[in-house]
């Protein structure tokens, strides 16, 4: 029986160009966690093996760093990151529990955009 | 040069136990997590164990589970798989493997050690 | 635990053929599939990982592809040398499986 809850950081903002963790958490079960995957839709981001270590995708590795923990660190935000992450754990002996986060990168504050003028 | 060499494999009875070894050298042992793989007569091949680098953590598949142990020693730059309660299905080519730096994939294996359970 | 088939067990082509060696997993696995290289008497060799990127060392001729269940191992030219058991591993949910092997022989 699967008894086991994901906690995660839910939904989330950061702005473009800035970076943000993706953390979630499993709690309320023994089982035990054999490897986390992080995914973005339908892309596998990042494995985490509990003896094998991070493994980060060729496609992410220029912008994705590991942790901290089993969390994942995207950086050099775009809008294009917008969307549904998720975190996998795989665990023994209770099989695959799922997190969601959703992220949405913003443009710039206007008070960012406005400190680069200057008021003639 | 990395290097691994496995040693210990030998002509077991069913229900008895086998000690491997697997003895590393030309990386930085205590860095990386090691695993044991096996291949059975019929080719096929098997994970059937894990350990991280500290030896902190491990992980058997269920076919194994309970019955192999995975250890190492950091400061012999070993790693061992201690085996009980030998079955005929166990009876394979064990080899010790390490993945690559930044590599999803065993990138080194030993030359393996051929385990045969017969009575 | 996912199971990953390889169709052909064997597999005959002449050299300077393209063959194409498959393997399909039993659920999406996202690309993390590696393929490797045993040759007679030898121990297994890697030749891809993260289904499409060659491993050091491995000549251009091979060529990994795929996604979702489907993944393919192509050696554009057969020499013979490539004489081997090729096998696919999945590293997307432990514990980490391998196929059955695909035996390629030389006409």
């Known amino acids: 029986m699967m008894t086991g809850t994901i906690e995660t950081t839910g939904n989330i903002s950061a702005e473009k160009g800035g970076s943000i963790i993706l953390q979630c958490h499993l709690s309320s079960t023994t089982a035990q966690v054999t490897q986390v995957n992080w995914e973005q839709q339908d892309q596998l981001l990042a494995i985490c093996n509990a003896d094998l270590g991070w493994h980060i995708s060729p496609s992410f590795k220029d912008r994705v760093a590991p942790g901290p923990g089993l969390g994942l660190t995207l950086q050099s935000l775009t809008v294009n990151d917008t969307g549904e992450y998720f975190c996998i754990y795989h665990t023994y002996p209770d099989g695959t529990y799922t997190g969601r986060i959703f992220l949405e990168v913003l443009e710039s504050s206007v008070a960012e955009h406005g400190a680069r003028f200057q008021i003639p | 040069e990395v290097k691994l060499q496995e040693s210990g494999g030998g002509l077991v009875q069913p229900g008895g136990s086998l000690k491997l070894s697997c003895a590393a050298s030309?990386?930085?042992?205590?860095?990386?997590?090691m695993s044991w793989v096996r291949q059975n007569p019929d080719k096929r091949l098997e994970l059937v164990a894990t350990?991280?680098?500290?030896?902190?953590?491990?992980y058997y598949p269920d076919s194994v589970k309970g019955r192999f142990t995975i250890s190492r020693d950091n400061a012999k730059n070993t790693l061992y798989l201690q085996m009980s309660s030998l079955k005929s299905e166990d009876t394979a080519m064990y080899y010790c493997?390490?993945?690559?730096?930044?590599?999803?994939?065993?990138?080194?294996w030993g030359q393996g050690t051929l385990v045969t359970v017969s009575s | 635990d996912i199971v990953m088939t390889q169709a052909h067990k064997f597999m005959s082509t002449s050299g300077g053929d393209r063959v194409s060696i498959t393997c399909k997993a039993s659920?999406?696995?996202?690309?993390?599939v590696s393929w490797y290289q045993q040759k007679p008497g030898q121990s297994p060799k890697l030749l891809i990982y993260?289904?499409?990127t060659r491993h050091t060392g491995v000549p251009d001729r091979f060529t990994g592809s795929g996604s979702g269940t489907d993944y393919t191992l192509t050696i554009s030219s057969v020499q013979a040398e490539d004489l081997a058991l090729y096998y696919c591993?999945?590293?997307?949910?432990?514990?980490?499986?391998f196929g059955g092997g695909t035996k390629l022989e030389i006409k």
């Open positions: 493997a390490r993945l690559g730096t930044g590599t999803l994939g065993f990138a080194y």
């Open positions: 030309g990386f930085t042992f205590s860095s990386y997590g």
């Open positions: 350990i991280n680098s500290n030896g902190g953590s491990t």
């Open positions: 659920q999406d696995v996202k690309t993390a």
């Open positions: 993260w289904a499409s």
């Open positions: 591993q999945q590293h997307y949910s432990t514990p980490w499986t």
